[in-house]
């Protein structure tokens, strides 16, 4: 598409008082320019023209994507989880080849009883979700399984999950020490070989709001920070009001630049304002300062 750029003569007054005139253009001959999808690069900072307006990339906004937002949406997961890979040895069941087939009657029954037993073992752990058998092998029955833990996201979620994994270890060690065969028989729901209990691996959800904030802030990463409100993280620049890190620009407007947040001071009918925080007022008629 072709766009007509209207051109007119404009007079500006510079700070020295001289008048500058822009070159005149014959208005009867409209200047046209070819636009390649982005309205002559009208959209800055990687934004693109959608035919009506600039679609800006985070962290930019404005008609030409030239302004930096004060806060960036970061969305921590609602829940976070941990997966523990454990091995226990069940002695109250004799291994048969059918147990290797996860669709067999034998596997389904073993899975049901084992799940019921583990639900009893871990019943006092609020983060406990369930168990998932990954493999059964000979010896009586060596049970490779995952213990699944989940909790609501809070800033302290790692501590909560770490604590839960410790309790899992304590509880599985206790049950596999206590529920053992006596005279070649088991009087519990399941019996275990005490020495067959092992924790293979622990995987915890990794979510770092600071990292997400820095990534989304791009070249402004050093100036955006995370603050919490009601256990929810907010990715903010100092120009966002209402937080501990908020910059007070007094008689001015906070604006982000590549050197950080700065205050653009206003001029009123009666005062000029200056200073880093626009807190120094100079009366226009009298030249003394108010602090």
């Amino acid at each position: 598409p072709l766009a007509t750029i209207p051109v007119s003569t404009t007079s500006l007054t510079s700070s020295e008082g001289s008048t500058i005139s822009t070159p005149s253009v014959d208005i009867s001959t409209p200047v046209t320019t070819s636009i390649v999808g982005d309205q002559c690069s009208r959209c800055k900072n990687g934004g693109f023209w959608d035919g009506l307006k600039c679609q800006c990339l985070t962290p930019y906004y404005g008609e030409s994507c030239e302004e930096v937002v004060n806060s960036i949406d970061i969305a921590p997961p609602e829940t976070v989880s941990a997966q523990m890979e454990l091995t226990v040895t069940v002695t109250s069941v004799k291994f048969t080849d059918e147990l290797k087939n996860h669709s067999s009657q034998e596997f389904r029954e073993f899975n049901k009883t084992f799940t019921e037993q583990m639900n009893i073992v871990y019943s006092g752990i609020p983060e406990y979700v369930g168990v998932n058998i990954t493999n059964l092998r000979l010896g009586s029955v060596v049970v490779e399984h995952d213990v699944l833990l989940r909790t609501k996201y809070t800033p302290e979620y790692k501590t909560a999950l770490d604590n839960a994994t410790e309790v899992v270890k304590q509880k599985i060690t206790k049950v596999t020490t206590e529920q053992i065969m006596t005279n070649d028989n088991c009087s519990a729901l399941m019996c275990f070989n005490t020495t067959g209990t092992q924790v293979q691996n622990i995987t915890v959800t990794q979510y770092d709001p600071v990292e997400e904030c820095r990534q989304k802030a791009e070249e402004y990463e050093d100036y955006f920070l995370v603050e919490y409100r009601d256990q929810k993280p907010y990715c903010i620049s100092p120009c966002e009001s209402g937080f501990n890190a908020s910059k007070n620009c007094n008689h001015g407007k906070c604006q982000m630049s590549q050197n950080g947040a700065r205050c653009l001071c206003v001029t009123t009918e009666t005062h000029w304002y200056s200073g880093e925080d626009c807190n120094q007022g100079t009366q226009k008629s009298h030249h003394h300062h108010h602090h």
Epitope: T91, S92, V93, E98, K112, T113, N185, S187, C191
Partner: nanobody, 124 residues
Amino acid sequence: DVQLVESGGGVVQPGGSLRLSCAASGYTSNRYSMAWFRQAPGKEREVVAFIWTDGGRTYYADSVKGRFTISHDNAKNTLYLQMNSLRAEDTAVYYCAASSLLLQTINPRAWPYWGQGTMVTVSS
């Protein structure tokens, strides 16, 4: 699913004999566990005996050793309990239980399949 149907209960005098039967259906394998449990009025359910159908294992509770015999007919898929020298304390509802696993547990909760029970009364 596995179905169990008991029969053979009744009233018998002390010192007498009875044979209980339990017909099983619904198994996909010929190797599994079967057991007899009993529950006297006001008491917990307790194991009497169990057997692996491959012949690999039999177990008897101390109170019935030498008097009761558990057996299994693979061709008929039927479990039996031959009870001799019956005593008044053997009076109870006798239940047939089964598992597709080769179980070595006397805890009734570990046994997933159950019959409806048959009453055995030993009385003079």
